[in-house]
Amino acid sequence: SGTTNTVAAYNLTWKSTNFKTILEWEPKPVNQVYTVQISTKSGDWKSKCFYTTDTECDLTDEIVKDVKQTYLARVFSYPAGNVESTGSAGEPLYENSPEFTPYLETNLGQPTIQSFEQVGTKVNVTVEDERTLVRRNNTFLSLRDVFGKDLIYTLYYWKDSSTGRKTNTTHTNEFLIDVEKGVSYCFFAQAVIPSRTVNRKSTDSPVECMGQEKGEFRE
């Protein structure tokens, strides 16, 4: 028991990458617990993370039902044990999150260069099509499945020994670039959604250089 009053959550923040979506908030609870609710603008409030002492809640299962919807979450604070509540007239304390539209706002995860193959003066570079937690017909969709032509990849490449970088873009997950025969090149990729106003670009993929185990070389 105690006399510490229940306090409302604050700093509600969405953390989302490739649709894996977690709501975070403060403060760390003292003599209180939280329950989270999530809703679309036109939908009903669905409770998640019941009576938790965590300050985060994984809402992925809810948002992947329709990633183009706009979601709102709220965090309720309830007294733990025999602690007084500050809610007026028995109303629970809660705080609303900012709105969140997964399709427009989820961060693009760091891409991975899956393979590269050199044939003469051409190199075919393939970026891995990452699996998301979005489902259709009981199978998980890839990033390309979800975003379609909205998603492009940019490849940055350069001669191993030089500093001058070139770029190439693709609406698929493959690049075909011109190289000089017998010269080693390095490259990295970046996922981009040009139509976005926020979170347009992913972080850079790890750099891969020709001559490493991911590559194939044919005359």
Epitope: T35, W45, S47, F50, Y51, T53, P92
Partner: antibody
Framework: QVQLVQSGAEVKKPGASVKVSCKAS????????MHWVRQAPGQGLEWMGI????????VYAQKFQGRVTMTRDTSTSTVYMELSSLRSEDTAVYYC??????????????WGQGTMVTVSS | DIQMTQSPSSLSASVGDRVTITCQAS??????LNWYQQKPGKAPKLLIY???NLETGVPSRFSGSRSGTDFTFTISSLQPEDIATYYC?????????FGGGTKVEIK
């Protein structure tokens, strides 16, 4: 098998306290919430509160706030519900009930056999 | 608190009949609703969780559905062993609350 075994019937005087125990077996005690639900004779079910056996955190229905205390002993996989300042209207069968898995977190999938508490002068 | 209004409070039906019980929530509770069966002198037993999911081991004659704030529990073909009181329970809002119960008897 998974089961919850509760302590025996109690008869108490008004103003006294009662402490009911509920011993869990057949599953990992810390992984599931435990609830207490009561049922007055011939009446419906009433939720009293919840305890998280992992950290001992409790949340009570406002109606019982200040009168109920739920505790747990992880060494014996037992939860306890103590109700103080008893009055005649507290005469009821008291059940412990396990909260389900993450899929159905607040569905009571396993119940104790119930403990009859009679408050009479 | 969320009020769960269950109806009817009692009903009498013949073996083989289709039995329907409804539960209305005083506000939107999404699909956060469970159904229990309680036989005389026994603890309740979970039958349906999240409005329409059948608990493991429960016969398929039991089912649940939702339409807005109205929830329906159905026994497709009443059996003698189904004589009991049935309760709905919401968990979308604190505190968790139960309906008043429906007593099912055989004609």
């Amino acid at each position: 098998q998974v089961q919850l075994v509760q302590s025996g019937a109690e008869v108490k005087k008004p103003g006294a306290s009662v402490k009911v125990s509920c011993k869990a077996s057949g599953y990992t005690f810390a992984n599931y919430y435990m609830h207490w639900v009561r049922q007055a004779p011939g009446q419906g079910l009433e939720w009293m509160g919840i305890i998280n056996p992992s950290g001992g955190i409790t949340v009570y229905a406002q109606k019982f706030q200040g009168r109920v205390t739920m505790t747990r002993d992880t060494s014996t996989s037992t939860v306890y519900m103590e109700l103080s300042s008893l009055r005649s209207e507290d005469t009821a069968v008291y059940y412990c009930a396990r909260g389900g898995s993450k899929v159905a977190a607040l569905a009571f999938d396993i119940w104790g056999q119930g403990t009859m508490v009679t408050v009479s002068s | 608190d969320i009020q769960m209004t269950q109806s009817p409070s009692s009903l009498s039906a013949s073996v083989g009949d289709r039995v329907t019980i409804t539960c209305q929530a005083s506000q939107d509770i999404s699909n956060s609703l469970n159904w229990y069966q309680q036989k005389p002198g026994k603890a309740p037993k979970l039958l349906i969780y999240d409005a329409s999911n059948l608990e493991t081991g429960v016969p398929s004659r039991f089912s649940g559905s939702r339409s807005g704030t109205d929830f329906t529990f159905t026994i497709s073909s009443l059996q003698p062993e189904d004589i009991a009181t049935y309760y709905c329970q919401q968990y979308n809002f604190h505190p968790l609350t139960f309906g008043g119960g429906t007593k099912v008897e055989i004609k």
